[in-house]
């Protein structure tokens, strides 16, 4: 299987993480997608998910997390605004494909949020007090409980199987964007043999 990698991002409290999860293939466009946190020794926990089927360009808000799926470009946009120190952790996007296990997207993000705000290069240092305006069409989707027969043997765990509903909702405020892309991991290729080995490297981060 493709080796999962992590990218570390160090942000200040109040900043915004803006992630583009690249799912690439049309067959995934309508699939429900989720943003998960992976805590050491635990299974991934779903913090937010799109609707099922996932709607095009239709923001879904769960607390300070906004998901927006752009079918025409194969991109899931994930924004975590007004970051807090306690948001630090390992995150990933997945695509739900029940009854199969979710398809993981990579690279995973190791987010480290530290106290105090200092503008990053290219950021707007005066935007700390700006209220993040959620589009009026924003909705909240219910995320499925997904249980897997797999056993977690790695640390940190790399299973994408077990997810649960979000347990907190927090206030929204905006600041600086840190932009990052993620690409499709080819677990689906291995399970269904749908894409040849020749294709696999094209889905990886260059």
């Amino acid at each position: 299987a493709t080796k999962l990698t992590e990218e570390k991002y160090e942000l200040k409290e109040g900043q915004t993480l803006d992630v583009k999860c690249d799912y690439t293939l049309e067959k995934f466009a309508a699939s429900q997608k989720a943003w998960q946190i992976i805590r050491d020794g635990e299974m991934p926990k779903t913090l937010a998910c799109t609707e099922r089927p996932s709607k095009n360009s239709h923001p879904v808000q769960v607390g300070r997390i906004i998901l927006e799926d752009y079918h025409d470009h194969g991109l899931l946009r994930v924004r975590m605004v007004n970051l807090q120190v306690e948001d630090s952790g390992l995150y990933q996007c997945v695509i739900y494909q029940p009854p199969k296990e979710p398809h993981m997207l990579f690279d995973r993000i190791r987010l480290v949020v530290t106290k105090g705000f200092s503008g990053t290069p290219g950021s707007n240092e005066n935007s700390t007090q700006n209220v993040y305006k959620i589009p009026p069409t924003t909705t909240k989707a219910l995320c499925p409980l997904y249980t897997s027969p797999r056993t977690v043997t790695q640390a940190p765990p790399k299973s994408t199987a077990d997810v649960s509903t979000p347990d907190s909702e927090i206030n929204l405020t905006n600041v600086t964007d840190i932009i990052r892309e993620q690409k499709l991991i080819s677990e689906e290729d291995l399970e269904q043999k749908l894409i040849s080995e020749e294709d696999l490297h094209h889905h990886h981060h260059h």
């Epitope: 583009k20 690439t24 049309e26 194969g74 894409i195 094209h202």
Partner: antibody
Framework: EVQLVESGGGLVQPGGSLKLSCAAS????????MHWVRQASGKGLEWVGR??????????YYAASVKGRFTISRDDSKNTAYLQMNSLKTEDTAVYYC????????????WGQGTLVTVSS | DIVLTQSPDSLAVSLGERATINCRAS??????????LHWYQQKPGQPPKLLIY???NLESGVPDRFSGSGSGTDFTLTISSLQAEDVAVYYC?????????FGQGTKLEIK
Amino acid sequence: EVQLVESGGGLVQPGGSLKLSCAASGFTFSTYAMHWVRQASGKGLEWVGRIRTKSSNYATYYAASVKGRFTISRDDSKNTAYLQMNSLKTEDTAVYYCTRDMGIRRQFAYWGQGTLVTVSS
Amino acid sequence: DIVLTQSPDSLAVSLGERATINCRASESVDTFDYSFLHWYQQKPGQPPKLLIYRASNLESGVPDRFSGSGSGTDFTLTISSLQAEDVAVYYCQQSNEDPYTFGQGTKLEIK
């Protein structure tokens, strides 16, 4: 190994019709959109059109120069894409390439060798 | 339609020297921070070959003397040290909007 092989080119009179085929192998054909690109002798590349996958209801898109005259289709069971060309004009004379992208609006990583279509009286 | 204009139309560079080709779009080819702009190399009698995708990503197997940069409407393909086998026509292409479009091509020769 991914392979795309075009066929069906040849000489046709103005106003005539021709159907090109693109036989694909080495990958899961149904997963990807397929495109046609053409190139007149000594000229640049011109995108002709694309056909998306079943997930997108086989939606098709065309360049303005061929819209209404050309039709792209596919048969996933035969791993083949087609370009039906009607009301051909002399300016349609070109090498026609079949190409496969790497996903939604992604780059053309694989190309066939092309098939020559000559429209002349 | 998005029009891609390459400059120059032709370019002669000495072996080992840097070659730079520009591509300007009539409107942005970006969606978020992704630039849906790609570069291809074509040699006589051959189909095009992908060099760079999404503005700056080097295609697997392509020598690292090739690089791409830019975003929005202005993009550049750079060959850091021209080799004899780099003589070809180079095309930029956008896939951000239908219809997809190509630049008119830049012919690269050795001085």
